[in-house]
């Protein structure tokens, strides 16, 4: 009689993570008597996957009724495949004895696992940056297999070209990770902008994964200041406004100084939002001119988002009759009929 052969018909099998892998094995004879074992890998460090004789292998089931002695099909199914299951599997016939001894091995079946990449995570710089500066964004995705993967960067739908990408590890592995760093130049209009990292992989069937970062978390648009003097009905009162325009984020503190002395400090609250996502705010100061003998230097000092203060000053001539000394360039931000009679009173929008 011809000597028993162990046949593993599939040189390789590819399975998606989470699915079951069927590894085929048949023998050509019932002789010699002895069980079948499945191993992953070869040599002394091989891992036992299934032993027909004994053991508990909860993820492994036999495809055919292995307790029937006439059975020559020793194919197995391994459930809930993960990338860690990748490798070459050998079906091995043992000859009965004390102990049983290895008789013949199949040629092996290489199991490769198709694993989806994790959702890309995009992270930006730790500190905010101002327009015209270049900032770096990173994108990471893990756990995919095979190694081939495509990563693209976009800013508001426009593909970026200034980025570097690495796939690790360089050598063979059960699964891989991708890490990419993109450089983005900020503009004043970027409050509403998004940076997108897009990952395409064979397991995603043409539907790439995306990770996003909002530039609103990264950008700081410093305000522009304008101090103007408004006419008032009362002859001894002057209304001075400080228009704070086009700033982001909203965190802003304004201090009025009269001749260098702090008159009042307030925090931006009722702001108006511009179409580009930046904010405008206006504060005004009602100055009682009769309380001053000399000219008054009024300073609007703004501390935005913890940055060093910026300021704008306005000289108020006390000797001259109060008259309009500046045009109201932010008329849309006024609208209160409220009148204040003490120079510490104010109103802001």
């Amino acid at each position: 009689e011809e000597e028993l052969q162990v046949i593993q018909p599939d040189k390789s099998v590819s399975v998606a993570a989470g699915e079951s892998a069927i590894l085929h094995c048949t023998v050509t004879s019932l002789i010699p008597v002895g069980p079948i074992q499945w191993f992953r890998g070869a040599g002394p460090a091989r891992e036992l996957i299934y032993n027909q004789k004994e053991g508990h292998f909860p993820r492994v089931t036999t495809v055919s009724e292995s307790t029937k002695r006439e059975n020559m099909d020793f194919s197995i199914s391994i459930s809930n495949i993960t990338p860690a299951d990748a490798g070459t599997y050998y079906c091995v016939k043992f000859r009965k004895g004390s102990p049983d001894t290895e008789f013949k091995s199949g040629a092996g079946t290489e199991l490769s696992v198709r694993a989806k990449p994790s959702a890309p995570v995009v992270s930006g710089p730790a500190a905010r940056a101002t327009p015209q500066h270049t900032v770096s964004f990173t994108c990471e995705s893990h756990g995919f297999s095979p190694r081939d993967i495509t990563l693209k960067w976009f800013k508001n739908g426009n593909e970026l070209s200034d980025f570097q990408t690495n796939v690790d590890p360089v050598g063979e592995s059960v699964s891989y990770s991708i890490h990419s760093t993109a450089k983005v130049v900020l503009t004043r209009e970027d409050v509403h902008s998004q940076v997108i990292c897009e990952v395409a992989h064979v397991t995603l069937q043409g539907d790439p994964l995306r990770g996003t970062a909002n530039l609103s978390e990264t950008i700081r648009v410093p305000p522009t200041l304008e101090v103007t003097q408004q006419p008032v009905r009362a002859e001894n009162q002057v209304n001075v406004t400080c228009q704070v325009r086009k700033f982001y984020p909203q965190r802003l503190q304004l201090t009025w100084l009269e001749n260098g002395n702090v008159s009042r400090t307030e925090t931006a609250s009722t702001v108006t939002e511009n179409k580009d996502g930046t904010y405008n705010w206006m504060s005004w100061l009602l100055v009682n001119v009769s309380a001053h003998r000399d000219d008054v230097k009024l300073t609007c000092q703004v501390e935005h988002d913890g940055q060093p203060a910026v300021s704008k000053s306005h000289d108020l001539k006390v000797s001259a009759h109060p008259k309009e000394q500046g045009s109201n360039t932010a008329a849309e931000n006024t609208g209160s009929n409220e009148r204040h009679h003490h120079h510490h009173h104010h109103h802001h929008h």
Epitope: Q52, G55, P58, R69, G97
Partner: antibody, heavy 119, light 107 residues
């Protein structure tokens, strides 16, 4: 060392049920099967059935099908054999024995549980 | 179902004798036959599995042979502790079945 400890002797009335336990120790319980074999006084050995402790797959001898129930509790590493509708000819020593899944030999045996069925 | 017939049902022998017990299966069972020893009031003990593989810890005076339908258990140089009842068991298919036993007694 590998041990199978069985529950104590039982005396039952005809028509009743008996449940015998077999506590395993000294090996990985889920790696083997547990056979149940009985021996009527003065007679030979009679195989009743087995359970694969790992996946609870069960095979019963046709002779006992419908009257015997073999179960296992992996957390307690214990196998059980329940025989119902007892009759006097069920008076026997009931053994549990560890087995493999291929040669179906029984390499470790419990000491046996004597079940007496008498009215 | 596979029947297993053991012979003789009993035999008398002396210490030092060579004893052979035979077992015949009702159909070919390849090498799937096991041998057990049982002493009065005790549980059976596995001696040989898969027709000829000696179980760990069993003295080498015990040996098994055979394949297909005819099998034998041989005890070379019988010792006092070997007087017991011996059973064969086919493990080719379920239901597993035992032979009727062979009682080895002191002559």
């Amino acid at each position: 060392q590998v041990q199978l400890v069985q529950s104590g002797a039982e005396v039952k009335k005809p028509g009743a049920s008996v449940k015998v336990s077999c506590k395993a120790s000294g090996y990985t319980f889920t790696s083997n099967a547990m056979h149940w074999v009985r021996q009527v006084p003065g007679q030979g050995l009679e195989w009743m059935g087995w359970i694969k402790a790992g996946n609870a797959e069960i095979k019963y001898s046709q002779k006992f099908q419908g009257r015997v129930t073999i179960t296992r509790d992996t957390s307690a590493t214990t196998a059980y054999m329940e025989l119902s509708s007892l009759r006097s000819e069920d008076t026997a020593v009931y053994y549990c024995a560890r087995g493999d899944y291929y040669y179906y030999y029984m390499d470790v045996w419990g000491k046996g549980t004597t079940v007496t069925v008498s009215s | 179902d596979i029947q297993v017939t053991q012979s003789p049902s009993s035999l008398s022998a002396s210490v030092g004798d060579r004893v052979t017990i035979t077992c015949r299966a009702s159909q070919s069972i390849s090498d799937f036959l096991n041998w057990y020893q049982q002493k009065p009031g005790k549980a059976p003990k596995l001696l040989i599995h898969a027709a000829s593989s000696l179980q760990a810890g069993v003295p080498s005076r015990f040996s098994g042979s055979g394949s297909g339908t005819d099998f034998s258990l041989t005890i070379n140089s019988l010792q006092p502790e070997d007087f017991a009842t011996y059973y064969c068991q086919q493990s080719y298919s379920t239901p597993l079945s035992f032979g009727g036993g062979t009682k080895v007694e002191i002559k």
